[in-house]
């Protein structure tokens, strides 16, 4: 077969080839931040000749040109500056309205790299309508002006500019327009990682979390779907397979839905995954009428096993039949449940299509998603039941219409995007998730991705003053109790000027509280060994100070999970019959277990917890301690089997202030708290210039470090006494 | 609050000794870690030891260990320093401090003596 001529470079741009010279491969131009390229792609095609998708003249030069935001068509009950054409990037629009309209939205706007204003729509609005003015986004044109119960506006986009979002909207009874803000972009415009993680996460989180069967009530904030206890998530995975699909590119989608997968499964909602791959013709690799499908290992080793060449007979992008196979699914789950029964009605369905270009056979997808829509139900009251994330990626041959067409429209809510490749797509599923903007109090979440504050990925952590300072550290364990050691607390009982500083999400400082009841171990005895040569002795340093006010939960305050309790047999994944042993045997299962604290600085510092036999070594060097225990003959009558024991080879030490805080560990995305800092023969910290220099004990030292926090597993039948009816907990 | 008050400083020759007092007033102070810091002219402030408020476990820094000792008289409110070996780098204004969280870090401190000036010097 003859190859593609290959005099197809782009000026100031690079391309990439999907399958070489030969016929069928896609090239792909791509332009530095700030210019786009023209063409964005070319295919070679069977005669050798390439081909521009959408062209109708002959083959032009490639070049990368400036790309520029959408110019306001109109904006109404005010002014706007600069009045050009369209914006280059980095350009500023600013807006003004009369007298007698107040501005909502952004005042100044910037036009970014990506061809995609910042900020919001700005609107000038006197608030006489039922509905607020809904405005008009850049480059759109509106028809419709009245803002009544029933009214409705219509909207279209400008020259060649392209219309996501809603083309129509209604003013509801409730005072909200249905749908979603429609927006107007040029059509090479790609949407940022940035944006996309949070906008996809928002809708998304509302499914997840949401059924914490252990909450008696539940106080739904806006939309927030409620999968009861016997409520159901199916998701469905399409991924795209077809001929543009690199085999790396479809490796990046395996990685993302597995990534996806990890995530969704890590949340207590009782789940079932479809994994859908397709080109030409769909091909289920796992459907929700499979019982493995609940089961993430099975789930993901199916998305594993999901082979490129399984599509390489039928290469193309047929949207519609994947589509229909998940129509398909459903109709054979309403038939096999009833369609009547409260099972099928109360299943929630999410479907992520993730696609690189525009369907080109088998029909309009459109037409299966009327059917999907039909099948479920769909109307006002039920428009939580469907949602479906359309998801262009490569932002080449994707049709922005088309996707837009696909997915949902719901108020507040964004369910079309076009990434600009799949490390951006791998980007988004990594941080889409951040669920730890629920409000209930689900445990043990902190937000993993690269620019979260320290706060929000520990938001559990709070920090004590007994005293003007600073002393101790503690954690979340509930909206009202903290848990933290009882050495912190040596001056009596009066702790009328105790506070505790909680994450908040308004302040960078925190929010304090006051103590209403401290429940300090009355086996707490620094001195009790004293006669036996033992001058401090840190057995029963476990105290709980229950708040004054409940925490209002946020990204920044959140309670770690306790093991041992139903909430975090739930975060485990654990059947419902698991005892605190079993949570043991899962959490503290290696001789060193990788754990975690948190320093003074807030960030969170590594250690490793030493079990069985390696316990016994890691506590045997306090036998060297001679000013604490100038006479010790047996090193467990300083650390008993209440401790932990951490400090050897690269393991931080945690400083005197950091006492009280959380031991814990990470598994399934989700954070468990195994025990708190107690004591240790070496303080980093010591006479630090402040909270962010720590000084590493030189290797010679004698004893060398050496850290112990109090097992939470050895302090049960306390924790049960003082938490029975605030958590759940397991037998023993 | 805890309000420090620095004595015992003087002139010393090499290899001589002093002993150091501090005394706070404040009946919290058995609840306090105490320590001693110093800051020789043109140099920033640093740490010397400290002890805990059990006065179970101290801690030097490494240019004195084996030469000073600090201890702790609860009954008395009063933190010493027993400096022997003295040499001229420790020539130096000596603080008191105390802390309840025991770290010393002197972005923190809020509670210092006025110092005192020990010179040794031959």
């Known amino acids: 077969a003859p190859s593609c001529p290959q005099n197809v470079n782009i000026s100031g741009g690079t391309f990439t080839l999907s399958h070489g010279w030969a016929p069928g491969s896609l090239l792909t131009y791509s332009c530095p931040q700030g210019l786009y390229p023209s063409p964005a792609s070319r295919l070679c095609k069977s005669s050798g000749q390439w081909q521009t998708p959408g062209a109708t003249r002959s083959l032009s030069k490639a070049v990368c040109k400036p790309v520029r935001c959408p110019a306001p068509v109109s904006f109404e009950n005010g002014i706007y500056t600069p009045r050009l054409g369209s914006y280059p990037v980095g350009g500023n629009v600013s807006f003004e309205c009369e007298d007698g309209f107040i501005l909502r939205g952004s005042p100044v706007r910037q036009c970014r790299p990506n061809g995609m204003w910042d900020g919001e729509t700005a609107v000038c609005d006197n608030g006489a309508g039922h509905c607020p003015n809904p405005g008009i986004s850049l480059g759109a044109v509106r028809t419709g002006f009245r803002f009544g119960h029933g009214d409705k506006v219509r909207y279209r986009c400008s020259s060649n500019l392209v219309l996501t979002g809603s083309s129509e909207r209604e003013c509801q009874g409730n005072g909200v327009w249905s749908g979603t803000e429609p927006i107007c972009r040029q059509p090479y415009s790609y949407d940022f990682p940035e944006d996309v993680a949070p906008a996809l996460g928002t809708s998304f989180s509302h499914m997840l979390g949401a059924t914490n069967p252990t909450q008696k009530t539940k106080e739904s904030l806006g939309r927030k779907i409620q999968i009861q206890r016997s409520g159901h998530l199916n998701l469905y995975l399409l991924l795209d397979c077809s001929q543009s699909v690199s085999e790396n590119d479809f490796l990046i989608f395996k990685e993302s839905a597995s990534l996806m997968v990890d995530r969704i499964f890590s949340f207590e909602i009782n789940v079932s995954v479809a994994i859908i791959t397709f080109a030409s013709e769909p091909k289920v690799l796992m459907s929700v009428l499979n019982d493995n499908s609940r089961d993430m290992t099975e789930v993901i080793s199916s998305l594993e096993n999901a082979n490129y060449k399984d599509h390489e007979n039928g290469t193309g992008t047929n949207t519609y039949a994947a589509l229909n196979s998940v129509y398909l699914m459903m109709n054979n789950q309403m038939r096999l449940l009833g369609m009547e029964t409260m099972a099928w009605q109360e299943i929630r369905h999410a479907i992520i299509l993730l696609t690189d270009g525009k369907s080109n056979m088998g029909g309009s997808p459109k037409t299966a998603v009327d059917h999907i829509r039909e099948i479920l139900n769909i109307n006002q009251k039920r428009n939580d039941y469907l949602d479906i994330y359309a998801i262009g990626v490569g932002k080449l041959d994707v049709d922005w219409r088309e996707l837009n067409e696909l997915g949902s429209k719901k108020d507040g809510e964004r369910h079309a995007f076009i990434l600009q490749d799949t490390k951006a797509l791998h980007q988004v599923f990594e941080h889409m998730l951040d669920v730890s903007k629920l409000t209930d109090t689900i445990c043990g979440v902190g937000n993993m991705s690269a620019n979260a504050s320290d706060q929000e990925r520990t938001p559990w952590h709070v920090t004590i003053k007994p005293k003007s300072q600073e002393t101790c550290r503690g954690a979340l364990i509930s909206d009202q109790w903290v848990l933290t050691a009882a050495h912190c607390f040596r001056d009596g009982n009066d702790h009328s000027l105790w506070r505790v500083n909680v994450g908040d999400p308004k302040s960078q400082w925190g929010k304090e509280f006051l103590i209403e009841k401290a429940v300090i171990s009355p086996g707490f005895d620094v001195f009790a060994k004293k006669n036996q040569g033992i001058l401090e002795f840190y057995g029963d340093d476990i105290a709980l100070l229950k708040l004054a006010q409940k925490v209002k939960m946020s990204t920044h305050a959140r309670p770690i999970c306790l093991p041992c309790t139903m909430e975090a047999n739930l975060a485990l994944r654990r059947p419902q019959g698991s005892t605190c042993r079993d949570h043991e045997n899962e959490l503290l299962n290696k001789q060193s277990v990788p754990a975690h604290f948190v320093a003074l600085n807030g960030s969170k510092l590594n250690i490793n917890l030493k079990m069985g036999v390696e316990w016994t070594s890691c506590a045997e060097v306090v036998s060297q301690e001679k000013t604490m225990f100038p006479n010790l003959t047996d090193v467990r009558e300083v650390v008993t089997d209440q401790f932990l024991c951490s400090g050897t080879q690269e393991d931080e030490s945690p400083c005197k202030g950091e006492s009280g805080g959380a031991v814990f560990l990470e598994r399934r995305f989700r954070f468990f708290q195994v025990g708190l800092v107690s004591w240790g023969l070496y303080n980093p910290c010591l006479g630090s210039a402040d909270k962010n220099s720590r000084k590493r004990a030189p290797r010679s030292k004698v004893p060398p470090p050496r850290d112990f926090h109090i097992n939470l597993f050895r302090m049960q039948p306390w924790l049960r006494q003082h938490l029975g009816d605030v958590l759940n907990f397991l037998p023993l | 609050q805890v309000q420090l008050v620095e004595s015992g400083g003087g002139l010393v020759q090499p290899g001589g000794s002093l002993r150091l007092s501090c005394s706070a007033s404040?009946?919290?102070?058995?609840?306090?870690?105490m320590g001693w810091f110093r800051q020789a002219p043109g140099k920033e402030r640093e740490f010397v030891a400290a002890?805990?408020?059990?006065?179970?476990?101290?801690e030097y820094a490494d240019s004195v260990k084996g030469r000073f000792t600090i201890s702790r008289d609860n009954s008395k409110n009063t933190l010493y320093l027993q400096m022997n070996s003295l040499r001229a780098e420790d020539t130096a204004v000596y603080y008191c401090?105390?802390?309840?969280?025991?770290?010393?870090?002197?972005?923190?401190?809020?509670?210092w003596g006025q110092g005192t000036l020990v010179t040794v010097s031959s």
């Open positions: 401090a105390a802390d309840y969280s025991g770290d010393f870090l002197l972005s923190d401190l809020d509670s």
């Open positions: 002890i805990s408020w059990t006065g179970g476990s101290t």
């Open positions: 404040g009946h919290t102070f058995r609840s306090y870690y």
